[in-house]
Amino acid sequence: PRSIDVKYIGVKSAYVSYDVQKRTIYLNITNTLNITNNNYYSVEVENITAQVQFAKTVIGKARLNNITHIGPLDMKQIDYTVPTVIAEEMSYMYDFCTLISIKVHNIVLMMQVTVTTTYFGHSEQISQERYQYVDCGRNTTYQLGQSEYLNVLQPQQ
C-alpha cells in the first residue's frame, strides 16, 4: 500500500461569543484538512478526532465519524469544527479578548488532529499538530494558511 497523506491546511473560520457574567469565551473553530489517497484503491475516512489546546490546557474536542471515502489517487478537502471554551482558570483571557482598544485579539492555539482511515479491513492513523493564531475578539474568516503561527515562534515542547 502507498501512503495516505494528511495535510492540515489551517483555520477556515472562528466564530466567537461571550458569557459576560461568567467571563467565558466560546470559540467555534472550523479547520480544513487535505487528505490524499496515493493508492490504486478507495479508502474510507472512518473518523477524525481533534482537540484544541490553549496554554497546554485542552479547551475543546470534536469527533467526526463515517466521514467520506476517497477514490484511487484522489484528494478530498474536509472541514471540521471544534467548539472550544475558554473559562474558569483562563477567564483572565476574557478581558484581553473583549478589549475594545485593540483591533486584533490574536491568541495562539495548538490544533491537534488524528485521521483514521481504513482499507481492506486495515486501519491506519495519521496525526498532525500545528500552532495557529485565532482572533478571539471577533468573528473571522481566514484565507487558508493565513492563521499559521510561524514555527520559529513555537514554544519548545
Epitope: S17, Y18, D19, V20, Q21, K22, Y26, E88, E89, I100
Partner: antibody
Framework: QVQLQQSGAELAKPGASVKLSCKAS????????MHWVKQRPGQGLEWIGY????????KNNQKFKDKVTLTADKSSSTAYMQLSSLTYEDSAVYYC??????????????WGTGTTVTVSS | DIVMTQAAPSVPVTPGESVSISCRSS???????????SYWFLQRPGQSPQLLIY???NLASGVPDRFSGSGSGTAFTLRISRVEAEDVGVYYC?????????FGGGTKLEIK
Amino acid sequence: QVQLQQSGAELAKPGASVKLSCKASGYTFTSYWMHWVKQRPGQGLEWIGYVNPSSGYTKNNQKFKDKVTLTADKSSSTAYMQLSSLTYEDSAVYYCAREGGSISDWYFDVWGTGTTVTVSS
Amino acid sequence: DIVMTQAAPSVPVTPGESVSISCRSSKSLLHSNGNTYSYWFLQRPGQSPQLLIYRMSNLASGVPDRFSGSGSGTAFTLRISRVEAEDVGVYYCMQHLEYPYTFGGGTKLEIK
C-alpha cells in the same frame, strides 16, 4: 420542585472551623453554579463566592479568601462551605444560592434555607 | 469593587398605594451587549431572599406584575404598585456584572 436544603445551626468557639452543607434537589446539580452569601444579624447581604459543581472550580470574594473553602460533591448533589479560624465577626446566617439562567443572563433564582453560625466562647 | 447604594434605609407606605425604591451603582452596569446587570431581591422577615427583577427590568418567574424595574446604567428603581401587606420586608439591589458581586444596604418597606 427545585430546592436547596441547608444544614442546621452551628455553635462554635473562636478559632474553630465549621462546615456547612447545601443539598440540591429537583434539578441537575452539575448544570448550575452554587454561590454563597453572608448576612450578619440585622445587616445586608455579602457575596462570598461560588463553586462550579461540574468542574470543582471555585472563585472567592478576596475578602473571604483565607476564611472560606468551597467544595461540591456530585454524587450527593451537595455543596459545602468550610469556615476556618472563626471569629465573632463570622457569626451570621449563610445562604447558598443557585445561579440559574443561560448565557449572559444569569441570576440567583433559588436560595437555600440559610444556616445560622454563632461564634461564642 | 462596585458599590451599590440604597439611600433610603426605610420607606413607609399605605396599603394600596404605589412606592418606588431607588439604588445607585458606582459604575455603569450597562454592558455593550445592551443588558444592564442590576437585580432586585426581597427578603421577607425571617425568610431567605427571593429574586424579583433581573437585568434591571425583567420580572422573575412567579413574581406579581405589581413589581417593575427600570433605570439607567447607574440609577435603578424598583416600583411596587398597589402595595399589599405581604410586600413588607427588606429590598436589596445587586450588581451581577463584575466580581465580587455586591449588594446595596437594603431598604425596608414598612406599612403605615
